[in-house]
């Protein structure tokens, strides 16, 4: 049964009963507020495999253990996020361990698990078998991993019965408890999911499978569920729904809200059913469930009742997905998240029109403006003190604010200040100034020359490709050297490359301050004769992939306050030769007589050219009378584990509790001080752990109802 | 052809809970949101509850509380659990398949009684 | 809720005479109003569905207009079979409402 949409479970335990017969929850699940301890061992609830939107868990009383509620919950697909979270754990003042042994796949989004005092078996868990992006996850504030002393199955018998992987260097046993293992695929599923036995599922599957390779035995879908089978896309006459399932028009039809009327029911376009017709398009008549374009702009005015609305994650952007034009003010305040370039886009990318300012401070996770990528006119009907419209402070990694080569933007009224952005070139923001009309309206302290672009290599110089050398796995590019007017200004070379399909990528695509960046770099010295070109060998690259190539001098970037010159290339693309492809897949040969064998198989999934032909080989094969010698039903031991070498940890003996070393001197001393820049750290942290505690309230507390 | 049956009516003592149950027949039950409507003697037509396509119910402020609509898509059945009856419950109780804002048919049950009485 | 009021409550005609029933809703309701047939006991039939809309199956004498918080059904030449009573019907906002009734009988 698919229950839905979204369900709150609070103050009395025996909701839980709501679940009782869900196998899918279509939208989100919050169990919350419980205050009176209770015994849960009662309630289970099986059935569940799969949550679409995100799982909230926020101070439930007496609740030890998820595992026992949902022994088989496998994917949460994160379709929408709570706070730019799938899996919020927090509060929760006796659970002692996640124990979510099955779950395989969160889908879209990250994890927070926060002030939970009795939390353990948070260390035995490799999130990345389970998530994309390990790196925004938020655990914090539980139970400290030294007290816990958290211990795999078997470990104590030196009988383990988990698998290893490496986790910060760290190679250890996984698992959930103290009795189940984190489950992992053999590697020759590559990214498919696999059964309890090992076998691999069908590549539609997601999480887990009931028999191997059958798109109709899958426990979730990789894409999308229809009539009992996992498809690729939706098939004809159906429709895609809440992003996992297809449905016809009659159950789009069907779709009822409280907040809206029945005329502003749920439309049909593009394949999907929808809550409303995305923007560009309106609907097609009165009493129509189709989307057309809209004849010149059709505008989708979102108003905050608050006048300013402030974008802190990526939950508060997905409120003006489609909006077009905002009437109040917009303030950007994204400290971190997960791939949020591509997230702000998503939901922001429409907006035209901002009636009142722009205001972006503290926002250390972009890096470009480009996210508002249809953004066009600034309207300045209210203005920040100062009479201010574009106001940008303190983004510490902000380098980009549009392509002004291909935007247009007005600024119809107000001035434009900026300050403390370390990375942004004040050429850029001058640029700005005569693309928006507002030059002259600044006085000179709204543009600081001074600690905007302090930290950046300004450039102003093109470096030139001199050859390139490509073979199967490895491109060599050499250029000219770049010759500031100081040689002692230029210090390395950095060389930006990704895989690049179509030539269509700019230097800040999917390019966020949190880690998620689409270009690998690599640092290159200058070479120490002066006459030698530099250059690089990149290498472990695939064969028979157009890669874009770019690479841009490091230079010192203040010289008594005035900025020097730096230099980049323009964006280089060349494609790899081609080389052998990997292996057929999925070889089957079968015999139809007693003189023929038949024999199939699949593309390889590296061709690593363009396929021409197969060769197939045979040999007759002796009987190897090993295979009868073997014993397969034994195991050969195998050594369990690394023994104690007889040092004893310094901290669980010393005295004195403060062991750091300072200085040249080795010893217990006092700890050193923290700098500005870790105390500004842990002061954002906290103000950022207040921002989540807030938003968390914000969403949970609701008036009783009369 | 497109029918809605309906059983479970009878008599209830109040405080008591009934549950009726409409059986679809001629047309993809799982694609159309299904409703309630009751009928007091001698008294006009009153919607009481609804569950869409997704399961999201809707009620009205008179049963809220103390009736729970439901429905069971691989039975083609749709059910409403009535706890904590009073007097005022009484009424013919038609299980309907209403048209919607873009189109469709109506489809009514033949009705069923329910009588809360001591 | 949106509150639907009909008049008159009852309505006096004689057969082959025009009948105008009205229903007013207390907010706007855009066309999601709908007119039904009830005989004493059967369920109801729709008649016309969306303020104007008639359906196949159900004779043309029986029309609607209106729109927002104003509607009309018009019967144009009472049959016989055509005294019953009429209820009208919002879809627009949950909860769903109806009106209390318009009883047509025999003048």
């Known amino acids: 049964e698919i229950c839905g949409p979204g369900i709150d479970i609070r103050n009395d335990y025996q909701q839980l009963k709501r679940l009782e017969n869900c196998t899918v929850i279509e939208g989100y699940l919050h169990i919350l507020l419980i205050s009176k301890a209770e015994d849960y061992r009662s309630y289970r609830f099986p059935k569940l495999t799969v949550i679409t939107e995100y799982l909230l868990l926020f101070r439930v009383a007496g609740l030890e253990s998820l595992g026992d509620l949902f022994p088989n919950l496998t994917v949460i697909r994160g379709w929408k996020l709570f706070y730019n979270y799938a899996l919020v754990i927090f509060e929760m003042t006796n659970l002692k361990d996640i124990g979510l042994y099955n779950l395989r796949n969160i889908t879209r989004g990250a994890i927070r698990i926060e002030k939970n005092a009795d939390l353990c078996y948070l260390s035995t868990v490799d999130w990345s078998l389970i998530l994309d992006a390990v790196s925004n996850n938020y655990i914090v504030g539980n139970k400290p991993p030294k007290e816990c002393g958290d211990l795999c199955p078997g470990t104590m018998e030196e009988k383990p019965m988990c698998e290893k992987t490496t986790i910060n260097n760290e190679y250890n046993y996984r698992c959930w408890t103290t009795n189940r293992c984190q489950k992992m695929c053999p590697s020759t599923c590559g990214k498919r999911a696999c059964t309890e036995n090992n076998e691999c599922c069908h590549p539609e599957c997601l999480g887990s499978c009931s028999a191997p390779d059958n798109d109709t035995a899958c426990v979730a879908c990789r894409h999308y569920y229809y009539a009992g089978v996992c498809v690729p896309a939706c098939p004809p006459n159906t429709y895609r729904f809440e992003g996992w399932r297809c449905v016809d028009r009659d159950f789009c039809a069907n779709i009822l809200s409280a907040e809206s009327s029945d005329s502003e029911g749920f439309v049909i376009h593009d394949g999907e059913c929808m809550q409303e017709c995305p923007s560009g398009f309106i609907r097609n008549g009165s009493q129509s469930m189709y989307c057309i374009p809209c004849e010149g702009p059709c505008p989708k005015v979102c108003e905050e009742e608050k006048k300013t609305k402030t974008i802190d994650s990526v939950t508060s952007a997905q409120m003006l997905q489609g909006c077009t034009i905002f009437k109040g003010n917009l303030l950007i305040n994204i400290r971190r998240g997960n791939n949020i370039a591509s997230e702000l886009e998503n939901f922001m990318g429409l907006i035209e029109v901002v009636t009142g300012y722009v205001k972006i401070r503290h926002s250390h996770a972009l890096v470009s403006l480009s996210f508002l990528k249809n953004l066009r006119l600034i309207l300045g009907e209210e203005q920040l003190e100062g009479n201010y419209s574009f106001y940008v402070l303190d983004n510490q990694n902000l380098q980009q604010l549009w392509d002004w080569d291909h935007r247009n933007l007005t600024i119809k009224a107000g001035k434009m200040y900026f300050a403390f952005n370390p990375k942004l070139c004040v050429s850029e923001i001058y640029r700005m100034e005569e693309v928006t009309g507002t030059k002259g309206r600044q006085s000179k302290g709204d543009i600081n020359t001074r600690n905007n672009g302090e930290r950046a290599s300004c450039e102003s110089d093109v470096l030139h490709f001199t050859s390139t050398t490509t073979s199967k796995n490895r491109i060599i590019i050499t250029w000219h050297r770049y010759r500031p007017p100081d040689y002692r200004d230029l210090i390395s070379f950095t060389v930006y490359y990704k895989e690049a399909p179509f030539k269509n990528v700019t230097e800040y695509d999917g390019q966020d301050a949190c880690g998620s960046n689409s270009w690998n770099m690599v640092d290159v010295d200058l070479p120490p004769n002066k006459d030698v070109e530099p250059g690089i060998l990149l290498h472990g690259l695939k064969p028979w992939t157009q890669y874009a190539v770019y690479v841009k001098a490091v230079t010192l970037t203040m010289v008594e306050n005035d900025h020097i010159r730096g230099a980049k290339s323009e964006i280089l693309y060349i494609r790899t030769n081609a080389s052998v492809p990997s292996i057929p897949l999925d070889v089957l040969s079968a015999s139809n007589s007693s003189s023929q064998l038949i024999v199939k198989w699949n593309p390889p999934s590296l061709p690593n050219g363009n396929l021409s032909y197969y060769i197939v080989r045979w040999q007759r094969q002796p009987q190897d009378g090993y295979l009868y010698r073997h014993n397969y039903c034994s195991k050969d031991k195998i050594p369990i584990r690394k023994y104690a070498d007889g040092t004893i940890d310094i901290e669980e003996v010393t005295e004195n509790p403060k062991t750091e070393v300072c200085g040249g001197e080795k010893g217990p001393c006092c700890a050193c001080p923290k700098t500005e820049a870790e105390k500004q750290a842990e002061k954002e942290e906290a103000e950022y752990r207040k921002v989540f505690e807030n938003f968390l309230h914000n969403s949970i507390f609701v008036p009783r109802p009369e | 052809e497109v029918q809605l049956v309906q059983s479970g009516g009878g008599l209830v003592k109040p405080g008591g809970s009934l549950r009726l149950s409409c059986a679809a027949s001629g047309f993809t039950f799982s694609s159309f949101a299904m409703h309630w409507v009751r009928q007091a003697p001698g008294k006009g037509l009153e919607w009481i509850s609804v569950?869409?396509?997704?399961?999201?119910?809707y009620y009205a402020d008179s049963v809220k509380g103390r009736f729970t609509i439901s429905r069971d898509n691989a039975k083609n059945s749709l059910y409403l659990q009535m706890n904590s009856l009073r007097a005022e419950d009484t009424a013919v109780y038609y299980c309907?398949?209403?048209?919607?804002?873009?189109?469709?048919?109506?489809?009514w049950g033949q009705g069923t009684t329910v009588t809360v009485s001591s | 809720e949106i509150v639907l009021t009909q008049s008159p409550g009852t309505l006096s005609v004689s057969p082959g005479e025009r009948a105008t029933l009205s229903c007013r809703a207390s907010q706007s309701i855009g066309s999601s109003l709908h007119w039904y047939q009830q005989k004493p006991g059967q369920a109801p039939r729709l008649l016309i569905k969306?303020?104007?809309q008639s359906l196949s199956g159900i004779p043309d004498r029986f029309s609607g207009s209106g729109s927002g918080t104003d509607f009309t059904l018009t019967i144009s030449r009472l049959e016989p079979e055509d005294f019953a009573v009429y209820y009208c019907?919002?879809?627009?906002?949950?909860?769903?409402?109806f009106g209390q009734g318009t009883k047509v009988e025999i003048k």
């Open positions: 019907h919002q879809s627009s906002r949950l909860p769903h409402t």
């Open positions: 569950i869409d396509t997704r399961g999201a119910t």
């Open positions: 309907a398949r209403l048209g919607n804002f873009y189109y469709g048919h109506d489809v």
């Open positions: 969306h303020a104007s």
